[in-house]
């Protein structure tokens, strides 16, 4: 059997939250993009087919003021086919930092998603095909951008779930309701940024299957903050 | 509204320089590639240069070498440093901005500066 993931703080993950340096990283980040697709061709072309797909759902889209589109590019292309490789080089960014290619992309949706917050929180359902551990100790949190769905039914499908894997249950009130921007709105998608962190994590296998309750959710502060921006910022934090 | 706003421009000796300047307001500047056209009597107008929002460069091959084109994101304006002028290079230059996007092939909207005369004496 596979080895099980650990549920922990994510301690390798890229984190920025861009605070206090939007204005700045919004005049910089169309350059860190075009250095990504330079290193990157899979974004290249992930965010060439978005930016049409965009185009075409753009104006049946409810937005909020600031929201431009190169974030609504940024969401889109996240849908697609980019989740699996950017998640990755975002959880283990700290182990080679050099080879991180998604410095405007993790920008503009991170920034997506901050934009479209609307301060409610809401109990999602995320189903994986791979097993979580809790240690019992400590907060948590994911350290990745992370799809989860308002109804159970679709995080416990058979594109998401099986019976090794996790179902999640959160209480989330950072993740956003991103069915709009969706290439799949039925999946009614709710993307989670990986800084949320949860306080309160059970664990129980009643059903058959592993579950995981993540509640009291919170957004602290991260360990990186406005990295890419020159005037970079890294504090290490100890979250437990 | 969006708009553009030329300056610079005016009558120069040939193998002299000059800069023209175009600040566009009204739009979220960054994401917006920006072109600069001329038109010469007589002529049909030609795209000279053009900058992607990534900063990738484009040249008529009739400038390349002496014109740089560059933006300014904190500014929110393109530049056009014209080197080693040329009487051909006498026209009515005018600043584009095209749709948002990271292509780097530029594609014209409707959104034109009012145009700036450069007349190059030999």
């Known amino acids: 059997l596979a080895v099980p993931f650990m549920l922990d703080m994510a301690p390798n993950a890229f984190d920025d939250q861009y605070e206090s340096c939007v204005e700045d990283m919004e005049k910089k980040a169309p350059q860190l993009l075009q250095e990504d697709f330079n290193m990157n061709e899979e974004l290249k072309l992930e965010w060439e087919k978005a930016e049409i797909n965009w185009k075409e759902i753009k104006n049946s889209t409810s937005y909020p003021a600031g929201f431009h589109d190169f974030h609504g590019t940024a969401l889109v292309a996240y849908t697609g086919n980019l989740a699996i490789d950017f998640n990755r080089a975002v959880r283990d960014f700290k182990k080679s930092p050099d080879n991180f290619h998604y410095k405007a992309f993790h920008y503009y949706l991170t920034r997506a998603v901050q934009l479209l917050n609307d301060q409610g929180c809401s109990l999602v359902y995320r189903g994986t095909k791979v097993m979580f551990e809790y240690t019992g100790k400590g907060s948590v949190r994911f350290g990745q951008f992370s799809s989860s769905s308002l109804t159970k039914r679709v995080a416990l499908s058979s594109n998401f779930f099986s019976n090794h894997g996790t179902l999640f249950i959160i209480r989330t009130c950072l993740g956003v309701n991103i069915k709009e921007f969706s290439s799949f709105p039925r999946e009614e998608e709710v993307l989670i940024p990986g800084y949320e962190v949860y306080h309160k994590v059970t664990a129980q296998n009643d059903n058959g299957y592993n579950e995981i309750f993540l509640d009291s959710p919170e957004r602290k502060k991260s360990n990186f903050n406005c990295f890419y921006n020159g005037s970079a910022q890294t504090v290490n934090i100890d979250f437990s | 509204q969006v708009q553009l706003q030329q300056s610079g421009g005016g009558l120069v000796q040939a193998g002299g320089s000059l800069t023209l300047s175009c600040r566009v307001s009204g739009t979220h500047f960054p994401i917006r590639p920006l072109a600069w056209y001329r038109q010469a009597p007589g002529k049909e107008r030609e795209l000279v240069a053009s900058?992607?929002?990534?900063?990738?460069?484009n040249y008529n091959v009739a400038v390349e070498g002496r014109f740089i084109i560059s933006r300014d994101n904190y500014k929110d304006t393109v530049y056009l440093k014209m080197n080693n002028v040329k009487p051909e290079d006498t026209a009515v230059y005018l600043c584009n901005l095209g749709p948002a996007t990271m292509s780097t092939d530029f594609r014209p909207t409707d959104f034109w500066g009012q145009g700036t005369q450069v007349t190059v004496s030999s």
């Open positions: 900058i992607s929002a990534g900063h990738v460069t």
